[in-house]
């Protein structure tokens, strides 16, 4: 699995999991979330070479035309396969609020 | 919805179903295939800026942040969202056989 | 309905640079790639090259190290330049459609504008 | 790159007759060739592709076969109009190559 016990431990030119932190205020500019102050996020960067990791039959297709035709650009792209949610804290007046926001935190990539 | 309909009419650089026909023999090399020759694979390309057709809430968080920091490449990307099957003709020895390779063509595309 | 129409220069100096437009209508630029295919007078075709929806190009080997293809999506406008030309570049330039990305046959062509090469 | 040759160079037959023109790929093309028809200072205008396929449009009594290497634009009841220049092309490989042209005349 293209997950952080395989990427996080390789030199991986390929599509794998990268990590990324963000940071509400300074990243997103959200003013409104109390806690966390920013959070793991991850992404998922990489070229998407034959048979590495593809999702489906058409971007094991893509994969194969792209070898002849690169000036196409048709080939598959390196996305988030597995996430996670987030909890966070705000609130509403003086009111705290504890939310999860769903799929928040890439856990694994592949190529689609 | 990021399809024929509404990619094929448009001028559109952003994410979006782009037509692709793919020759079994000339393209992939694949010889087993009789029928047909080759078909409409489609892919899907361009940009993914923030708000266009994002997937999920990990790939809105990723566009807003790549706005402020597009040199971190960590920009979500434009892949396939809904695919068919096609029906293919192939023979084993003399005898044919019809089959259907799942997830083959793409019908709409998606920023993930 | 689908249309294509070259403009150019009629006449072009030796050495000198051509530049031709592509201008499409009944159509997107961002679905369909666009090829260039000359035919000298009283000659055969020759294709040049193309551009693909996503911006790509792919060129003839014999005119690569001379010929750029670019395109403006949003005027509907594809370009070719084409350096170094000689006597033997005249020809009439015609642009062309290709039905499917990848089909590699022309549908609908240009009406083609004649390129003369002469001092 | 892929040769086209193309023959004859020029053929003449009467109205109502059924002409053939063929084109030899110095390679296998696996079905992908194109048949064009060009009149005097016109663009070239699509009749056949994938060997066998008419396009949207053309008379049917247009078409096309393949036999190996071999592949060949028939044409029935000839026509006034059909005396013009066809011109086959391979759309398998880069570059993508035409034959040389076949120029049919009216007896």
């Known amino acids: 699995a293209l997950d952080a016990a395989y990427c996080f431990r390789n030199v991986q030119d390929n599509c794998c999991l990268r990590p990324l932190y963000i940071d509400f205020k300074r990243d997103l500019g959200w003013k409104w979330i109390h806690e966390p102050k920013g959070y793991n996020a991850n992404f998922c960067a990489g070229a998407c070479p034959y048979l590495w990791s593809s999702d489906t039959q058409h971007s094991r297709v893509l994969s194969l035309y792209n070898t002849i035709n690169p000036e196409a650009s048709a080939s598959p792209c390196c996305v988030s396969q597995d996430l996670e949610p987030l909890t966070i804290l705000y609130y509403i007046g003086k009111t705290p609020k504890i939310e999860q926001l769903s799929n928040m935190i890439v856990k694994s990539c592949k190529c689609s | 919805a990021l399809d024929a309909a509404y990619c094929f009419r448009n001028v559109q650089d952003n994410c979006c179903l782009r037509p692709l026909y793919i020759d079994f023999k000339r393209d992939l090399g694949w010889k087993w295939i009789h029928e047909p020759k080759g078909y409409n694979a489609n892919f899907c390309a361009g940009a993914c800026p923030y708000l266009w057709s994002s997937d999920t809430q990990h790939s809105r968080v990723l566009s807003l942040y790549n706005t402020i920091n597009p040199e971190a490449s960590a920009s979500p990307c434009c892949v396939s969202q809904d695919l068919e099957p096609l029906t293919i003709l192939y023979y084993i020895g003399k005898t044919p056989k019809i089959e259907q390779l799942s997830n083959m063509i793409v019908k709409s595309c998606k920023c993930s | 309905q689908v249309q294509l129409k070259e403009s150019g220069p009629g006449l072009v100096q030796p050495s000198q640079t051509l530049s031709l437009t592509c201008t499409v209508s009944?159509?997107?630029?961002?679905?369909?790639?666009v090829h260039w295919v000359r035919q000298p007078p009283g000659k055969g075709l020759e294709w040049m090259g193309l551009?693909?929806?996503?911006?790509?190009?792919r060129y003839n080997s014999a005119l690569k190290s001379r010929l750029s293809i670019s395109k403006d999506t949003s005027k509907s406008q594809v370009f070719l330049r084409m350096n170094s030309l000689q006597t033997e570049d005249t020809a009439t330039y015609y642009c062309?459609?290709?039905?499917?990305?990848?089909?590699?046959?022309?549908?609908?062509w240009g009406p083609g504008t004649m390129v003369t090469v002469s001092s | 790159d892929i040769q086209m040759t193309q023959s004859p160079a020029s053929l003449s037959a009467s109205l109502g007759e059924t002409v053939t023109i063929e084109c030899l790929a110095s390679?296998?093309?696996?079905?992908?060739l194109a048949w064009y028809q060009q009149k005097p200072g016109k663009s070239p205008q699509l009749l056949i592709y994938?060997?066998?396929s008419l396009q949207d449009g053309v008379p049917s009594r247009f078409s096309g076969s393949e036999s190996g290497p071999q592949y060949s634009l028939e044409i029935n009841s000839l026509q006034s109009e059909d005396a013009v220049t066809y011109f086959c092309?391979?759309?398998?490989?880069?570059?993508?190559?035409f034959g040389s042209g076949t120029k049919l005349e009216i007896k």
């Open positions: 551009i693909w929806n996503t911006g790509g190009t």
């Open positions: 390679e296998d093309i696996y079905s992908n």
């Open positions: 994938d060997a066998r």
């Open positions: 062309a459609r290709d039905p499917v990305p990848n089909k590699w046959h022309f549908d609908f």
């Open positions: 092309q391979q759309h398998h490989a880069y570059p993508f190559t």
């Open positions: 009944g159509f997107s630029l961002t679905t369909y790639n």
